[in-house]
C-alpha cells in the first residue's frame, strides 16, 4: 500500500495506490483512490508511467482528457467515470500487454488540494490449473494442466497422505510455448498415485501462485483450484 | 452405498434401435468415467463404451463403433447407451459399470439388462 | 489389442481345498489387472484390483499376484459361496478394455 501526500500550493490530500499485476492479453485494474471531493469539475486525474514521455490517462472536468496521451496507451485506458466523486481514481488497462510494466504514478488534484503516489505494476500471464486422472496412462497417474503462464513457473506436487515427500523423482513437467510465442502451457504428470489421498499441484512465478487439488476415493473425485496473485502491497 | 439400475431393455428386430439407461446414485456420479459392458447369453465379459466424467471422450469396441452411442446426463446422474442398427450378435445382458478411481477396473455393475435381437 | 487367456476353463474343487486359477496376458500389462466374480443370474463383483489389492468387503482367503504377463488368483479355503465363475480384466491398454475367457469354479 502506498499513501502520497501532496506538497507545495494547496493543501495535501491522501492517495492510496496498491501494487498489482496484469495478465497478459487480458484487461487489468491499476487501483488508486483519493480523498473524494464534492465537485466532479473540480477533480482532475492523470496517471503517468516512468520513461513513458506522454499521459497514460487523463481525466479533467468530468470527462476523458486524451490529446497528450502516449501512443502506447492509446484506446486502452479507461477510468471508472461514475466513481470518481467517490473517489475512486482506478484504470482500466484493457489487452495487457508485457510492456505495460513498471512504475505507475497516480496523480490528483481537487479543491482540497494535490496529491500522488506511486504504483508497482507487473505483467505476465497465470491461470488456473486443473487436476485429473489421466486414464490413459499405463500407471495411477494424475496430470495437471494450466493454459497460460509467464514467466516460466516452477511446479509442486504435493499430498495430504505423505506430506513433506518430495514427489520430483515421480513427476514429469513440460512447458509448450503458446501460438502468441509469449505464454506458455504448463502440464505437469504425477505418476504413482494412490487411493483414498488428495494431491495437490502448486504453479508459482514471481507474479502468481496457483493450486489445484484433487481427491481421489472410490466414490467421488473433488477438484478444487484457487489462484493468489503475489505481492499484493498497497502504497 | 453406490447404486447402478439399468433400464430399457427388451425384444427387438434386427436393424432397429434402442436406448438404455443406466440411474446412479451413492457417489458423485460426474466425477467418474462410466461403461458398459455386456454378456451374450452363456458367454463371457465384452467391454463395449466408455465415456469420461464430463462426456469430452468416448471410446468404443470395434465391434459396435459407428453403431452405439453412450452418452451422460450429469443433471440427472444416468448414462444411456444408443444402440443402433442392432444384429443378432448384440443379444446380451448389458451392464453398466462405474470405473475405479483411478484405473478403469470396474469397482461397481448394474444388475444389467437383457437385450434380445430376434426377428 | 491385448489377449487375455484363463486356465483352467473349468476347475473342480472340494470345499476346503486351495483353488488356484490362471490368466496370461498377450503382452506385459504391469500390475494393471482386475479379478471379477460371477455367479449366476447376477452382475460380476470385483474381487482384486492392481493384480493384488483386495476390494472393498473382499475376504482375506481370496488374493492376487503376479505382474507383467503372469497372473493368479488364489481362493486359499473354498467356501460353498466361492462356488462361480471367475474373469480376469486388463486396463493398461484400451480401447478395448479386455476380459479373458472365465474359468467356472465348481464343486467336486
Known amino acids: 500500500l502506498i499513501i502520497g501526500f501532496g506538497i507545495s500550493g494547496r493543501h495535501s490530500i491522501t492517495v492510496t495506490t496498491v501494487a498489482s499485476a496484469g495478465n497478459i492479453g487480458e484487461d487489468g485494474i491499476l487501483s488508486c483512490t483519493f480523498e473524494p471531493d464534492i465537485k466532479l469539475s473540480d477533480i482532475v486525474i492523470q496517471w503517468l508511467k516512468e520513461g513513458v514521455l506522454g499521459l497514460v490517462h487523463e481525466f479533467k472536468e468530468g470527462k476523458d482528457e486524451l490529446s497528450e496521451q502516449d501512443e502506447m496507451f492509446r484506446g486502452r485506458t479507461a477510468v471508472f467515470a461514475d466513481q470518481v466523486i467517490v473517489g475512486n481514481a482506478s484504470l482500466r488497462l484493457k489487452n495487457v500487454q508485457l510492456t505495460d510494466a513498471g512504475t505507475y504514478k497516480c496523480y490528483i488534484i481537487t479543491s482540497k488540494g494535490k496529491g500522488n503516489a506511486n504504483l508497482e505494476y507487473k505483467t505476465g500471464a497465470f491461470s488456473m490449473p486443473e487436476v485429473n486422472v489421466d486414464y490413459n496412462a499405463s500407471s495411477e497417474t494424475l496430470r495437471c494442466e494450466a493454459p497460460r503462464w509467464f514467466p516460466q513457473p516452477t511446479v509442486v506436487w504435493a499430498s495430504q497422505v505423505d506430506q513433506g515427500a518430495n514427489f520430483s523423482e515421480v513427476s514429469n513437467t513440460s512447458f509448450e510455448l503458446n501460438s502468441e510465442n509469449v505464454t506458455m502451457k504448463v502440464v505437469s504428470v504425477l505418476y504413482n498415485v494412490t487411493i483414498n489421498n488428495t494431491y495437490s499441484c502448486m504453479i508459482e512465478n514471481d507474479i502468481a501462485k496457483a493450486t489445484g487439488d484433487i481427491k481421489v476415493t472410490e466414490s467421488e473425485i473433488k477438484r478444487r483450484s484457487h489462484l493468489q496473485l503475489l505481492n499484493s502491497k498497497a502504497s | 452405498q453406490v447404486q447402478l439400475v439399468e433400464s430399457g431393455g427388451g425384444v427387438v428386430q434386427p436393424g432397429r434401435s434402442l436406448r438404455l439407461s443406466c440411474a446412479a446414485s451413492?457417489?458423485?456420479?460426474?466425477?467418474?468415467?462410466m461403461h458398459w459392458v455386456r454378456q451374450a447369453p452363456g458367454k463371457g465379459l465384452e467391454w463395449v463404451a466408455v465415456?469420461?466424467?464430463?462426456?469430452?471422450?468416448?471410446y468404443y469396441a470395434d465391434s459396435v463403433k459407428g453403431r452405439f452411442i453412450i452418452s451422460r446426463d450429469n443433471s440427472k446422474d444416468t448414462l444411456y447407451l444408443q444402440m443402433n442398427s442392432l444384429r443378432a450378435g448384440d443379444t446380451a445382458v448389458y451392464y453398466c459399470?462405474?470405473?475405479?478411481?483411478?484405473?478403469?477396473?470396474?469397482?461397481?455393475w448394474g444388475q444389467g439388462t437383457l437385450v434380445t435381437v430376434s426377428s | 489389442e491385448i489377449v487375455m487367456t484363463q486356465s483352467p476353463a473349468t476347475l473342480s474343487v472340494s470345499p476346503g481345498e486351495r483353488a488356484t486359477l490362471s490368466c496370461r496376458a498377450s503382452q506385459s500389462i504391469s500390475s494393471n489387472l482386475g479379478w471379477y466374480q460371477q455367479k449366476p443370474g447376477q452382475a460380476p463383483r470385483l474381487l482384486i484390483y492392481?493384480?493384488?489389492t483386495r476390494a472393498t468387503g473382499i475376504p482375506a482367503r481370496f488374493s492376487g499376484s503376479g505382474s507383467g504377463t503372469e497372473f493368479t488368483l488364489t481362493i486359499s479355503s473354498l467356501q460353498s459361496e466361492d462356488f462361480a465363475v471367475y474373469y480376469c480384466q486388463q486396463y493398461q491398454s484400451w480401447p478395448p478394455l479386455t476380459f479373458g475367457g472365465g474359468t467356472k469354479v465348481e464343486i467336486k
Open positions: 492392481g493384480a493384488s
Open positions: 451413492g457417489f458423485t456420479f460426474r466425477s467418474f468415467g
Open positions: 459399470a462405474k470405473g475405479g478411481g483411478l484405473r478403469w477396473y470396474f469397482a461397481y
Open positions: 465415456i469420461s466424467y464430463d462426456a469430452s471422450n468416448e
